[in-house]
């Protein structure tokens, strides 16, 4: 039961995380105009991975897409790539994990297959989460660098009276969404990997037969329980894993087949 819960929770957490990564990637507020210690402007500038926006004091908002590909900073391109890779891996991971869920039965899929799929999706979620965290962190680092550079040259003058106030940008909401979402996806992935260990069928002694020295009786003990043995080292409780096909009655994996809802 605990394995099913862990797997289910891992799936849900990852699902929320990936939804968050998609939301963060689409959001316009990756960087927002720093309002602290700056002249009060009648406009509010903010930028995303795909476009930059300006909200005027009237409420009028105008957004312009980055229509160039080659003209964009390499770091921005790298962040875009990381986020997209994160989304793609996460989406594939979700697809795989749906079929791997213990509570969902697809034909006569073995527990070993479900375990492998759970592990695969878990690894995908972990990598997806790491991609998102890396992407957001690279962007944040870029912002911090630019922030201090623009603070150093806050007023770039041409001598005389004329001054140009440089707009400084600080962390936008999308960064926090991205960090949290990446973290959730990562946690979900770890939970899936943990669930995989519980799902993997342990070596089960299906044909443990013990012989008594007197030869009167033969005790047949299914399911890997220790048989009462008479003598001899060969009668030790060795677990034998029969990886072959099993009948429906034999498929009694850790939560029983009646545990699914």
């Amino acid at each position: 039961m605990a394995v099913t819960a862990c797997q289910g929770l891992g799936f849900v957490v990852s699902l929320i995380g990936i939804a968050g990564i998609i939301a963060a990637t689409c959001m316009d507020q990756w960087s927002t105009q720093d309002l602290y210690n700056n002249p009060v402007t009648a406009v509010f500038n903010y930028q995303g991975l795909w476009r930059s926006c300006v909200r005027e004091s009237s409420g009028f908002t105008e957004c312009r897409g980055y229509f160039t590909l080659l003209g964009l900073p390499a770091m921005l391109q790298a962040v875009r790539a990381l986020m997209i890779v994160g989304i793609v891996l996460g989406a594939i991971g979700l697809l795989v994990s749906i079929f791997a869920l213990k509570c969902i039965r697809i034909g006569s899929m073995e527990d070993s297959a479900k375990a492998n799929m759970t592990l695969t999706s878990g690894i995908m979620f972990i990598v997806s989460g790491l991609c998102a965290i890396a992407g957001v962190s690279v962007f944040a680092n870029m912002l911090v660098t630019n922030f201090w550079m623009s603070t150093a040259n806050m007023y770039t003058g041409m001598g005389g009276m004329v001054q140009t106030v440089q707009t400084r940008y600080t962390f936008g909401a999308a960064l926090f969404v991205g960090w949290v979402a990446g973290g959730l996806t990562l946690i979900g992935g770890v939970m899936m990997c943990i669930a995989c260990r519980g799902l993997a069928p342990e070596e089960t002694n299906y044909k443990a037969v013990s012989y008594h020295a007197s030869g009167h009786s033969v005790a047949y003990k299914p399911g890997g329980f220790k048989a009462s043995t008479g003598f001899g080292s060969n009668t030790k409780n060795k677990k034998i894993y029969d990886g072959g096909a099993r009948t429906e009655d034999e498929v009694q994996s850790y939560p029983s087949k009646h545990d699914y809802v």
Epitope: P39, A42, V43, N45, S52, E56, S58, Q163, V165, Q166
Partner: antibody
Framework: EVQLVESGGGLVQPGGSLRLSCAAS????????IHWVRQAPGKGLEWVAY????????YYADTVKGRFTMSRDNAKNSLYLQMTSLRAEDTAVYYC?????????????WGQGTTVTVSS | DIVMTQSPDSLAVSLGERATISCKSS????????????LAWYQQKPGQPPKLLIY???TRASGVPDRFSGSGSGTDFTLTISSLQAEDVAVYYC?????????FGQGTKLEIK
């Protein structure tokens, strides 16, 4: 037709108070920020204050900060400027002006103005 | 505060002639976020409230004749009346629309020569 009509001006003694009103019609009042701008006799224009659509943001000129309070009642399509501790230099024609929606923050419609005279 | 300086203070131009008014700001009115200039021009006729002519440094407000045009970027802006008409006699103001407090130029009085 967009109309802004100011009222409440008059003669007041220095240190006194006055409340100006601006009645709006011909547009959805709650969709626009409104400014107060004044013009002293024979002088140029001086921006006084601004209030956003939902009153969440209010800005004042340094010359009136702490003395003037701007407010609005969207249900009544009305704007107010409460003026206290009035000085002789506050004598002017006071205009309310609508902040245009897509006019780069410029004021696209103005009222006819109301005259405030501060004198003893 | 942003200081807006207009020149000249007064200008006399013959009917049908070109009139040019200059406006300089102490800081750039070009917003880096959208590369747009936040400067407006107003016309005020005697006994009337101001009327918006140009916003965004170069966009004519609705109902403004096309003889009025605005140009410039950053800190230097110009209002041009290509062919002066009698009804253009007024005081013209430029205004900073980017930084609070919003500030106006001192005004340029345009008269007919």
């Amino acid at each position: 037709e967009v109309q802004l009509v100011e009222s409440g001006g008059g003669l007041v003694q220095p240190g006194g108070s006055l409340r100006l009103s601006c009645a709006a019609s011909g547009f959805t009042f709650s969709d626009y920020g409104i400014h107060w701008v004044r013009q002293a006799p024979g002088k140029g224009l001086e921006w006084v204050a601004y209030i956003s659509r939902g009153s969440s943001t209010i800005y004042y000129a340094d010359t009136v900060k702490g003395r003037f309070t701007m407010s609005r009642d969207n249900a009544k399509n009305s704007l107010y400027l409460q003026m206290t501790s009035l000085r002789a230099e506050d004598t002017a024609v006071y205009y309310c002006a609508r902040g245009g929606y897509d006019t780069r923050n410029a004021m696209d419609y103005w009222g006819q103005g109301t005259t405030v005279t501060v004198s003893s | 505060d942003i200081v807006m300086t207009q020149s000249p203070d007064s200008l006399a131009v013959s009917l049908g002639e070109r009139a040019t008014i200059s406006c300089k700001s102490s800081q750039s009115l070009l917003n880096s976020g959208n590369q747009k200039n936040y400067l407006a021009w107003y016309q005020q006729k005697p006994g009337q409230p101001p009327k918006l002519l140009i916003y965004g440094a170069s966009t004519r407000a609705s109902g403004v004749p096309d003889r009025f045009s605005g140009s410039g970027s950053g800190t230097d802006f110009t209002l041009t009346i290509s062919s002066l008409q009698a009804e253009d006699v007024a005081v013209y103001y430029c205004q900073n629309d980017l930084y609070y407090p919003l500030t106006f130029g001192q005004g340029t009085k345009l008269e007919i020569k």
